[in-house]
Amino acid sequence: MAVTACQGLGFVVSLIGIAGIIAATCMDQWSTQDLYNNPVTAVFNYQGLWRSCVRESSGFTECRGYFTLLGLPAMLQAVRALMIVGIVLGAIGLLVSIFALKCIRIGSMEDSAKANMTLTSGIMFIVSGLCAIAGVSVFANMLVTNFWMSTANMYTGMGGMVQTVQTRYTFGAALFVGWVAGGLTLIGGVMMCIACRGLAPEETNYKAVSYHASGHSVAYKPGGFKASTGFGSNTKNKKIYDGGARTEDEVQSYPSKHDYV
């Protein structure tokens, strides 16, 4: 029962985490204009992985996609890649874990197969979560670096009375969504790995065998722990854990004139 609960909870937590990673990847607010010196602004800039936007004081919002691929910073490309890898691994993990759920019966699938699938999905969730956390952290580091660089030269002289005020960017909501989502996916993956141990068969994988001892006959079947018998390889009363040697096959705008907000 505890195993089923751990597996089910791991699945749900991972599902929420992956949904969060997808949401974070799609969100426009990865970085938002720093309003420290000017809390009320006529033009509010914010940027995502795929487009950058402006919310005007008039209430209109306009976004512009990054239509170039080669012209984008390598770090941004890396963050995109990490987030997409995280989503893909997470999605595959979810697919595998659905079939691995103890509460779902699919044909005559053995517990050992479910255990292996649970472990596989758990590892995928862990890697997916790590990818998301890494992606968000790389972007955050990039922001911090740029923030202090733009603070150092906040005003770039243009001669005479003309000056260019650089827009400084700070952490956007998507970063926090990404960190939390990555963490949840990671936790879900760990829970799946833990559940895998409880799902593994407790003795060897052979069928029931009759042993004829002198004087009496006892049949041992794979199942609960047996005290006092010295038969089989499980002599020390430990659960047999097949460390996942048999893995399953892995199935691998521009907006109209105005968007009113």
Epitope: T41, S57, G59, E62, T164, K257
Partner: antibody
Framework: QVQLVQSGAEVKKPGASVKVSCKAS????????VNWVRQAPGQGLEWIGM????????RLNQQFKDKATLTRDTSTSTVYMELSSLRSEDTAVYYC???????????WGQGTLVTVSS | DIVMTQSPDSLAVSLGERATINCLSS????????????LTWYQQKPGQPPKLLIY???TRDSGVPDRFTGSGSGVDFTLTISSVQAEDVAVYYC?????????FGQGTKLEIK
């Protein structure tokens, strides 16, 4: 069609207050900010502030923070600007204008002349 | 506050000729998020309220004749009237829509020679 109709001309004594109204029609009143701009005789344009009709949110030019109070009445689709402690230099034509994309003012009222004279 | 400086203060051109009005901002009006310049041009005829001509530095408002063209980016902007008509006699203002308080240029008076 979009229209902003302002109240009539006012003559006030120094130290008095005046409340200028701007009635909007022909568009969804609560969706657009309304600006107030003043123009002294023979002078240029000066932005006073703006109010959002769906809430009490305002943006005021600091120069006018002790001078102008912006309010609205959604039931009548009207915005108001009250000017207090009037002085002779407050004599001007006061315009209301709708805020459009690009923070541009696309529709303007006909203007209200406020004369401050003793 | 952003200071908007227009030049010249007044301009006299013959009918059918080109008129150019410049507007210099004390600070860049370019928004990084959408790469648009928050600069607006208005036309004001005597006894009338101003009329919106161009927003986002180069986008003509609906109903504005195509002889009016806005250009420029960052701090330097230009309003060009390709072929001046008699009805274009007015005062032209540029406006900063980038940051509060919104500020206007002092105006440029266009007259017919």
């Amino acid at each position: 069609q979009v229209q902003l109709v302002q109240s009539g001309a006012e003559v006030k004594k120094p130290g008095a207050s005046v409340k200028v109204s701007c009635k909007a029609s022909g568009y969804s009143f609560t969706n657009y900010w309304v600006n107030w701009v003043r123009q002294a005789p023979g002078q240029g344009l000066e932005w006073i502030g703006m109010v959002h009709p769906s809430g009490s949110e305002t943006r005021l030019n600091q120069q006018f923070k002790d001078k102008a109070t912006l309010t609205r009445d959604t039931s009548t689709s009207t915005v108001y600007m009250e000017l207090s402690s009037l002085r002779s230099e407050d004599t001007a034509v006061y315009y209301c204008a709708r805020v459009w994309s690009g923070n541009a003012f696309d529709y303007w009222g006909q203007g209200t002349l406020v004369t401050v004279s003793s | 506050d952003i200071v908007m400086t227009q030049s010249p203060d007044s301009l006299a051109v013959s009918l059918g000729e080109r008129a150019t009005i410049n507007c210099l901002s004390s600070q860049s009006l370019l928004a990084s998020g959408n790469q648009r310049n928050y600069l607006t041009w208005y036309q004001q005829k005597p006894g009338q309220p101003p009329k919106l001509l161009i927003y986002w530095a180069s986008t003509r408002d609906s109903g504005v004749p195509d002889r009016f063209t806005g250009s420029g980016s960052g701090v330097d902007f230009t309003l060009t009237i390709s072929s001046v008509q008699a009805e274009d006699v007015a005062v032209y203002y540029c406006q900063n829509g980038f940051s509060f308080p919104f500020t206007f240029g002092q105006g440029t008076k266009l007259e017919i020679k």
